[in-house]
């Protein structure tokens, strides 16, 4: 299975030696080291950590470790003019102000440079007006408000609860609805799990805790001022008015203590149904404005943050391949954090550090991987995936020719229940085979495989006896590699029980309370889940870099393509009359999928039989596998989203975190019944079916015999 070329270690021993070298105690030690002070992108502290990681990766034995810097647009609160929200009376007096920062966690009272909660890239402004509660501010929430309840958000300040979708989508939706400001808050219904204490006594969010985060709608652009190109020393930068993805209205996040004060006075319409009610002791009235006694009071936002071009630093480590040095397997995760980064990102960075150490140990013993492994510590992920995107833009020509796979390594944990994997279908079999070889860390599964506990706790909705593997969306550093460049990508982490925990993400996400102690006391005291994630991520990298034949199975792509075609067809068939009227047919797509299935099957047969000792044929077959993901890239990109170029997958237009299949067709069909020009709308559906069918057929042909 694994190559023993250019090494004196036997193939079986290779992977085992690598995995055996990974130690939970080291991950714990690294996590502690990375979380003692804040490492906000663009700060001196994060630059110093970059240099520390560079130095340590060199010590671990990598061939080279370089810093790659870029000057990108970041956003910071004004140190002397803090952001806050007020309730003002008819005389304009502030009768209530939201907190300026979070109460410090115990042990961190004297830490300086904790950035106060803010919505990164919010414009400055001091809008005042009536409040409208918009639930999660999803597309469907605004449909409910505007279409069913006839509530107009124009000129209003909206208050939305965090959760369900990426915060940038909430802000975009609010802007489109005409709002003049957005208040984001964490409702206990989403960020306080029943039966668990709040920090520092458990992993729940205290009332003073606030989620930071960027509110951009970049759609894969990277640095807002240099879309498509690296933000280097000679970059041409757009003016701020032409910057990509910046919000146009002030936005600010608050905790649930402060939200209570705003929401308890709400009047106007009652919530449309129970799904609009959170867990605060307030009526969840939609508004607009406050109830009777308080109807003359208004809400005022005070936002003074500034956007600044700031230098960021990626750390790029190289372990040169012995046989195919021009084939790159990349393991990358970010280093920058909002505050201490106890989970996001340092639980991931600590795992990457230990993976590098283990690979370095093998290298010092005379081993090399077959292919080159690149390790990356990305900067400014929290500000819009900027470090990874700028580096990929700078190196796009190399990556599109040489990139075999990208494995993402942000937070290793978001819970401690079971494994969660999102990846390209090409990696399904790799993940299945690897997890069958790893021990489960779960209680009650002693002596059982990770595959077994994962399958039991998170079964596939389609295939019995198999675990759920999800589509890649976005909101993390794999985006540019997968959605723009078409490099096979995957991610793995330990997650919560989604059935019993309905809150969004983990409660302390992006708050000051995401500390080392949070992980060490409440999530993973033995660091056994971190170790398992290190084994999964590291094991995937090992196999991708070292197996003679790339561990990709193109037949799994065929299976999902059929599933996605069926799904999009079903959506379209909700409009049978229009499909008939406008002669909409999916025949070309189903035909292409059928062709892909047959060609993939034949390719797989050839893959079993070919002469692996012939380096030219081996390279040819591997190139067909490597370039299959690339074949799903449309150079023109998706409509209005030029950097989302993958025809099979894109981040949902309604939630950046979620993946959508056949996104071009999906978006063309979305809310089609409300389009003013149905002929044009259904024409776009037909065009998108054509693009998808062509792309699937073209991809299939890359797997055909070359001559």
């Amino acid at each position: 299975k694994s190559s023993n070329e250019a090494t004196n270690i036997t193939p079986k021993h290779n992977m085992k030696a690598f995995l055996d070298e990974l130690k939970a105690e080291n991950i714990k030690k690294f996590l502690y080291n990375f979380t003692q002070i804040p490492h906000l992108a663009g700060t001196e502290q994060n630059f110093q950590l970059a240099k520390q990681i560079q130095s340590q990766w060199k010590e671990f034995g990598l061939d080279s470790v370089e810093l790659a810097h870029y000057d990108v647009l970041l956003s910071y609160p004004n140190k002397t003019h803090p952001n806050y929200i007020s309730i003002i009376n008819e005389d304009g007096n502030e009768i209530f102000n939201t907190s300026l920062f979070e109460p410090p966690p115990p042990g961190y009272e004297n830490v300086s440079d904790i950035v106060p909660p803010f919505s990164a890239f919010s414009p400055q402004g001091m809008p005042e007006g009536d409040l409208v509660y918009v639930n999660y501010a999803r597309t469907e929430d605004f449909f409910k408000l505007e279409r069913d309840m006839k509530i107009n958000c124009s000129g209003k300040i909206v208050i939305a609860r965090y959760g369900k979708v990426f915060r940038g989508n909430k802000v975009k939706n609010a802007q489109l609805a005409g709002a003049k400001g957005v208040i984001l808050y964490s409702d206990p219904a989403d960020y306080f799990a029943p039966g668990v204490k709040s920090y520092p006594d458990g992993w729940n969010l205290p009332g003073g805790g606030v989620q930071r985060g960027n509110i951009l709608n970049l759609n894969g652009a990277g640095d807002p001022l240099t879309p498509g190109y690296p933000a280097n020393e000679y970059a041409y930068r757009r003016g701020i008015a032409e910057a990509v993805g910046l919000p146009s209205i002030p936005v600010h996040p608050i905790g649930y203590y402060d939200a209570q004060k705003l929401l308890e006075k709400m009047g106007g319409s009652a919530p449309p149904d129970s799904s609009w009610r959170g867990s605060l002791k307030v009526p969840y009235n939609v508004g607009p404005g406050f109830t009777g006694n308080f109807s003359t009071q208004k809400v005022k936002m005070h936002i003074h943050s500034t956007n600044e071009v700031t230098r960021i630093y990626n750390v790029i480590g190289t372990l040169r391949g012995a046989v195919e040095p021009d084939r790159y397997v990349i393991l990358g995760g970010h280093r920058d954090s909002w505050v201490f980064g106890g989970i996001d990102p340092q639980s991931g960075a600590a795992v990457v550090h230990e993976i590098v150490r283990s690979f370095g140990t093998l290298k010092k013993e005379g081993w090399r991987p077959r292919r080159t492994i690149l390790f990356a510590s990305w900067d400014a992920e929290e500000f819009g995936l900027l470090g990874s995107t700028e580096w990929a833009e700078e190196n796009s020509r190399l990556l599109q020719e040489r990139g075999v796979a990208y494995i993402n390594a942000d937070s290793s944990i978001e819970g401690n229940y079971t494994l969660r994997v999102d990846c390209t279908p090409l990696m399904y079999s790799l993940v299945h085979n690897l997890t069958k070889e790893l021990k489960s860390p779960d209680e009650g599964f002693e002596g059982k495989s990770l595959y077994e506990s994962w399958t039991k706790k998170s079964p596939s909705p389609e295939f019995s006896g198999m675990p759920r593997i999800s589509k890649l969306g976005s909101g993390n550093d794999f985006e540019v590699f997968f959605q723009r460049l078409g490099i096979a990508s995957g991610r793995a982490r330990y997650t919560k029980n989604w059935e019993t925990n309905k809150f969004s993400g983990y409660p302390l996400y992006h708050s000051v309370y995401e500390t080392y102690e949070l992980v060490e006391k409440f999530y993973d005291p033995m660091f056994k889940y971190h170790l398992t994630v290190a084994q999964v991520r590291g094991g995937m990298v090992f196999e991708l870099a070292n197996s003679i034949v790339l561990p990709f199975d193109c037949r799994d792509y065929a299976v999902v393509l059929r599933k996605y075609a069926d799904k999009i067809y079903s959506i379209s068939m909700k409009h049978p009359q229009e499909m008939k009227t406008y002669s909409v047919s999916f025949d070309s797509l189903f035909s292409a999928v059928k062709n892909f299935t047959e060609i993939a099957s034949k390719f797989s047969e050839r893959l079993q039989d070919f002469d692996k000792s012939n380096p030219i044929v081996l390279r040819m077959m591997n190139d067909q596998l490597m370039f299959l993901e690339r074949a799903f890239i449309d150079p023109l990109g998706l409509p209005d989203r030029p950097f989302y170029r993958h025809v099979i997958y894109a981040p949902s237009s309604h939630n950046k975190y979620a993946g959508e299949s056949f996104p071009g067709i999906y978006d063309a069909l979305f809310d089609i019944e409300s389009k003013v020009d149905p002929s044009k709308a259904w024409g776009e559906v037909k065009r998108q079916i054509y693009v998808a069918a062509f792309t699937v057929q073209a991809a299939a042909e890359t797997l055909s015999e070359v001559a």
Partner: antibody, heavy 119, light 107 residues
């Protein structure tokens, strides 16, 4: 009715030790952070130490943390303060107090017990 | 550590008068502030928490206000039982410190 009753204080020698206890009733003891607050005669209040719900986390006034140990026994509804190497400046009335959480006010107070450190 | 400065240290007032006690925090504590009343020879009793919320059973003549660094406790129409000492205390961070106290005496 909520009650917090501290054990007898008394006169102790400088350099010696003393263990105070506080017995709670009328509320669910394990649902509360507990603390010791002291008051030098005719002076203000000074927080000494706190302990979380299950005793897994303790917090101290920096100047006292090497000498004082707070603990609790939820089965017995008891709070303790072990005071070592006592000094004359530790002379005070010691109050047992209960709060709702880490970031919370002291909702319940005991009647206090006077500890006098003197030769 | 956050220091709490209370003023005045003492004041005399008559039954029926209104008095205001102020408390200043050395750092921003939002509304993480409590007020206590202590009568001679007794333990402190909670009056106000979260800067302005009256504790159960506290008469409405007491009111708390303020946010950030400046806070006040107002007693309208003093009653004989209101005389004693008053303390503010923050619970924003460890250590939770008290103000030096205000002794309210009958004029």
């Amino acid at each position: 009715e909520v009650k917090l009753v501290e054990s007898e204080g008394g006169l102790v020698q400088p350099g010696s030790s003393k263990k105070l206890s506080c017995t709670a009733s009328g509320f669910t003891f394990s649902d509360y952070y507990m603390a010791w607050v002291r008051q030098v005669p005719e002076k203000g209040l000074e927080w000494v130490a706190s302990i979380n719900y299950d005793g897994s986390s303790t917090y101290y006034l920096d100047s006292l943390k090497s000498r004082f140990i707070i603990s609790r026994d939820n089965a017995k509804n008891n709070l303790y303060l072990q005071m070592n190497s006592l000094k004359s400046e530790d002379t005070a009335t010691y109050y047992c107090a209960g709060s709702d959480g880490y970031w919370a006010w002291f909702a319940y107070w005991g009647q206090g017990t006077l500890v006098t450190v003197s030769a | 550590d956050i220091q709490m400065t209370q003023s005045p240290a003492s004041l005399s007032a008559s039954v029926g008068e209104a008095v205001t006690i102020t408390c200043r925090a050395s750092g921003n504590i939002h509304n993480y502030l409590a007020w206590y009343q202590q009568k001679q020879g007794k333990s402190p009793q909670l009056l106000v928490y979260n800067a302005e919320t009256l504790a159960d059973g506290v008469p409405s003549r007491f009111s708390g206000s303020g946010s950030g660094t400046q806070f006040s406790l107002k007693i309208n129409s003093l009653r004989p039982e209101d005389f004693g000492s008053y303390y503010c205390q923050h619970f924003w961070s460890t250590p939770p410190t008290f103000g030096g106290g205000t002794k309210l005496e009958i004029k």
